[in-house]
């Protein structure tokens, strides 16, 4: 990813994902330089004329910024001297996906690195006991996903069991007509067991766990971005 050698500095980027409608971060670090006024940061996007963002002489320079990024970007200005060139992106859109280049010039030299930015929607699932059902069942809901994910159930007691025959999953388009609400119901659940609802697309994987006993219900959920890292 980075370029090193005489007059070149190491620049490191991290593949990351943006959740549409929220803030996103394009991560980039470089060899620090205490001379802030000598640091130039340029962010470019493949297929876009003009810059995504430019920071030089200690401040933002938007004179060459492409219109689609106007008012939507900022570097973490107080962290530039310690080698952070990451870019904050406002209101992530599907069209923000693509290949970006982080280009750095300092008094020590110059370097650049590319990153792949994926965009979609992902959210934490919540599992509840569905008391409306005729038999004991669990309802797993996650408000925003895109592209359409796969949903699978697992259980601690019946490891390796296929729950597709005893579950029903639906995808409901949200009001903005892009993201979807995921609802999956698992039927015929047994007490004193831990069940997991796993939702996954090519951007993220989310898991919700629920343990139902006679006396209590314990829940836990986690979200993991896929393929993120250097």
């Amino acid at each position: 990813f980075g370029i090193s050698g005489k007059h070149f500095i190491t620049v490191t980027t991290f593949t990351s994902a943006g959740n549409i409608g929220e803030d996103g971060t394009l991560s980039c670090t470089f060899e620090p330089d205490i001379k802030l006024n000598g640091i130039v940061i340029q962010w470019l996007k493949e297929g876009i004329k003009g810059l995504v963002h430019e920071f030089k002489e200690g401040k933002d320079d938007l004179s060459q910024q492409h219109e689609m990024f106007r008012g939507r970007t900022a570097v973490f200005a107080d962290q530039v001297v310690v080698g952070n060139a990451s870019l904050r992106l406002k209101n992530v859109q599907l069209t923000d996906a693509g290949t970006y280049t982080c280009y750095i010039r300092t008094s020590k030299g110059k370097g650049n690195a590319n990153l792949e930015y994926k965009t979609g929607a992902f959210s934490m699932p919540e599992i509840n006991v569905d008391y409306n059902a005729s038999s004991e069942s669990l309802r797993c809901e996650a408000p925003r996903w895109f592209p359409q994910p796969t949903v699978a159930w697992a259980s601690q007691v019946d490891q390796g069991a296929n729950f597709s025959e005893v579950s029903n999953t639906s995808f409901e388009l949200n009001s903005e007509n892009v993201t979807m609400k995921v609802v999956s119901v698992l039927y015929n659940v047994t007490i004193n067991n831990t069940y997991s609802c796993m939702i996954e697309n090519d951007i993220a994987k989310a898991t919700g766990d629920i343990k139902v006993t006679d006396s209590e219900v314990k829940r836990r959920s986690q979200l993991q971005l896929l393929n993120s890292g250097p």
Epitope: K59, D60, G71
Partner: antibody, heavy 121, light 107 residues
């Protein structure tokens, strides 16, 4: 600390223009967007538009295009809004505010005290 | 253009109580909703941005939540100085939009 000092109240004739100012201090003027809003009693706030003093870039609410003109003078760290062809509907308090997040257009985090404009013959 | 419909337009609540104000966006989905307090003769004060992030120095009695098109703002343990007009701001799009405001009276 961040401060925005707006010009004083004005009584103006219908059909004329008025130019109000918003002087910024306590931060780098060219690095943050400045937004303008209109407040009429019983009507709440209306977004007029905003300007990035570092490059003169502007965004306008369609409703105020041709009515409001936003400018900025970097040397005096002052933003201006000119309102033209005034009618009684333009009688209101006008606020300027800094948008949080530097070149990223964030929420209006620091406001001026407002400029009251009364249009009357 | 996005419109923000705020409700109620006014409400009265007791000292120590709790109130909730809502704003509904006409379209779109993003977390860029801020809440302000405005008292007569003063400039508006930013309380919450990005749906639920409290501004520095704002007490935890104030809170915000929401997603999609529906956003809410709450004040608990109401104090006399909470008497004011509160309004929301949608700032995710090119054109920002304000809610109509809610006048809160403390009894």
């Amino acid at each position: 600390q961040v401060q925005l000092q707006q010009s004083g109240a004005e009584l103006v004739r219908p059909g004329t223009s008025v130019k109000m100012s918003c002087k910024a201090s306590g931060y780098t003027f060219t690095s943050y967007w400045i937004g303008w809003a209109k407040q009429r009693p019983g009507h709440g706030f209306e977004w007029i538009g905003d300007i990035y003093p570092g490059g003169g870039y502007t965004n306008y609410n369609e409703k105020f295009k041709g009515k409001a003109t936003l400018t900025a003078d970097k040397s005096s760290s002052t933003a201006y809004m000119q309102f033209s062809s005034l009618t009684s509907e333009d009688s209101a308090i006008y606020y300027c505010a800094r948008l949080d997040g530097s070149s990223y257009r964030g929420a209006m985090d620091s406001w001026g005290q407002g400029t009251s404009i009364t249009v009357s013959s | 253009d996005i419109q923000m419909t705020q409700s109620p337009s006014s409400l009265s609540a007791s000292l120590g109580g709790k109130v909730t104000i809502t704003c509904k966006a006409s379209q779109g989905f993003n977390k860029y909703v801020a809440w302000y307090q405005h008292k007569p003769g003063q400039c508006p004060r930013l309380l919450i941005h990005y749906t639920s992030t409290l501004q520095p120095g704002i007490p935890a009695r104030f809170s915000g939540s929401g997603s999609g098109r529906d956003y809410s703002f709450s004040i608990s343990n109401l104090e006399p100085e909470d008497s004011a007009t509160y309004f929301c701001l949608q700032y995710g799009n090119l054109l920002y939009a304000f809610g109509g405001g809610t006048k809160l009276e403390i009894k």
